[in-house]
Interface confidence: low
């Protein structure tokens, strides 16, 4: 026998208290699917997060973080507070990274320079707290001719060079 | 880093006044800012936010009355129609979304009398 | 707007007493919770953010916890110093639920 409440298509749900008829989601919920028993309610984006896109009566509601935070987590589950580059976000707000680290993006952590050595090569330009060191060919590599830069590859060591 | 209010003095029922907030040691740039008033004898009262872009939200009794502002360094509160209601030490906050607010001026007194 | 509930709105202990103050929020609030300490007179100081985070500086004896709707800030080993008013305060908004504070509770160090 064919369940009644697989003809509800999204958007609405199968009323027991009205048998079974195939009732529209109430204000502020929602069914993504059919044949479903109850409307789920609709996502609220308060507080730190903003509205993305409003809630329709087959689709949640999408949220994101009003200016000066950023999303974390599967669907934005979470706002963390914006800081800027050179900083990281601790448990007393914005620090700036500490020296031999560099946070180039808003978000994130600090994260030590590159110790050029590990290849073989030496520190062209020097790292800030908002710029990884940019290492160059080794003093051994410098003959006439010789001009490669190559982009530091991530390391966990911090460059030896003053900032 | 500290906040300063000024501008509250005594003024009549209807009299426009805008106070000011000064800000020094950080930037607006990198801070929410709030006014919070508090009537003689009572608790506080949230009036609005500044965020970091300069957008505004305000307690839903505040909207059309109060307007906040900024510069560089200070952040205004206008005030409008002032009934003796008004009569508060308003401070000024940072703070935000994460943390609270963190920082408070000593506040400056509006006394709207007749 | 979302509404604040302080209890009590006074409270008298002793030197090295223990002090819970609650605070109810009308909806979820989320851990969004504030606690702050104003003397008369004085601006407002926060002790607590996060609903249970201490901020710097602020002595261990001052202790919070809470979620959803229901909070609380405690005052152990009661000191003639921390006689103050003490406010919980719902600090994240954009719109809708608007900022608020709790109605204050007053704590009397006997």
């Known amino acids: 026998l064919q369940d009644p409440c697989s003809n509800c298509p999204a958007g609405t749900f199968c009323d027991n208290n009205r048998n079974q008829i195939c009732s529209p989601c109430p204000p502020n919920s929602f069914s993504s699917a059919g044949g479903q028993r109850t409307c789920d309610i609709c996502r609220q984006c308060k507080g730190v997060f903003r509205t993305r896109k409003e809630c329709s009566s087959t689709s949640n509601a999408e949220c994101d973080c009003t200016p000066g935070f950023h999303c974390l987590g599967a669907g934005c589950s979470m706002c963390e507070q914006d800081c800027k580059q050179g900083q990281e976000l601790t448990k007393e707000g914005c620090k700036d990274c500490s020296f031999g680290t560099f946070n180039d993006e808003e978000h994130g952590v600090c994260r030590p320079w590159t110790d050029c050595s590990l290849d073989g090569k030496s520190v062209l330009v020097n790292g800030t707290k908002e710029r990884d060191v940019v290492c160059g060919p080794s003093p051994a590599d410098l003959s006439p001719g010789a001009s490669s830069v190559t982009p530091p590859a991530p390391a966990r060591e911090p460059g030896h060079s003053p900032q | 880093q500290s906040l300063e209010e000024s501008g509250g003095r005594l003024v009549t029922p209807g009299t426009p006044l805008t106070l000011t907030c000064t800000v020094s040691g950080f930037s607006l740039n990198d801070y929410w800012m709030s006014w919070v008033r508090q009537a003689p004898g009572k608790g506080l009262e949230w009036i609005g936010y500044i965020d970091v872009g300069g957008s505004l939200y305000y307690a839903s009794w505040a909207k059309g009355r109060f307007t906040i502002s900024r510069t560089s360094t200070t952040v205004d509160l206008k005030m409008t129609s002032l009934t003796t209601e008004d009569t508060a030490t308003y401070f000024c906050?940072?703070?935000?979304?994460?943390?609270?607010?963190?920082?408070w001026g000593p506040g400056t007194l509006v006394t709207v009398s007749s | 707007d979302i509404v604040m509930t302080q209890t009590p709105a006074s409270v008298s202990e002793p030197v090295g007493g223990t002090v819970t103050i609650n605070c109810q929020a009308s909806e979820d609030i989320s851990s969004y919770l504030a606690w702050y300490q104003q003397k008369p007179g004085q601006r407002p100081k926060r002790l607590i953010y996060?609903?249970?985070d201490l901020a710097s500086g602020v002595p261990s004896r001052f202790s919070a916890s809470g979620s959803g709707t229901e909070y609380a800030l405690t005052i152990s080993d009661l000191e003639s110093a921390d006689a103050a008013t003490y406010y919980c305060?719902?600090?994240?908004?954009?719109?809708?639920?608007?900022?608020?504070f709790g109605g204050g509770t007053e704590v009397v160090v006997k």
């Open positions: 906050a940072r703070g935000g979304l994460t943390y609270g607010f963190d920082l």
């Open positions: 996060g609903a249970s």
């Open positions: 305060h719902y600090y994240a908004t954009i719109s809708g639920l608007g900022v608020a």
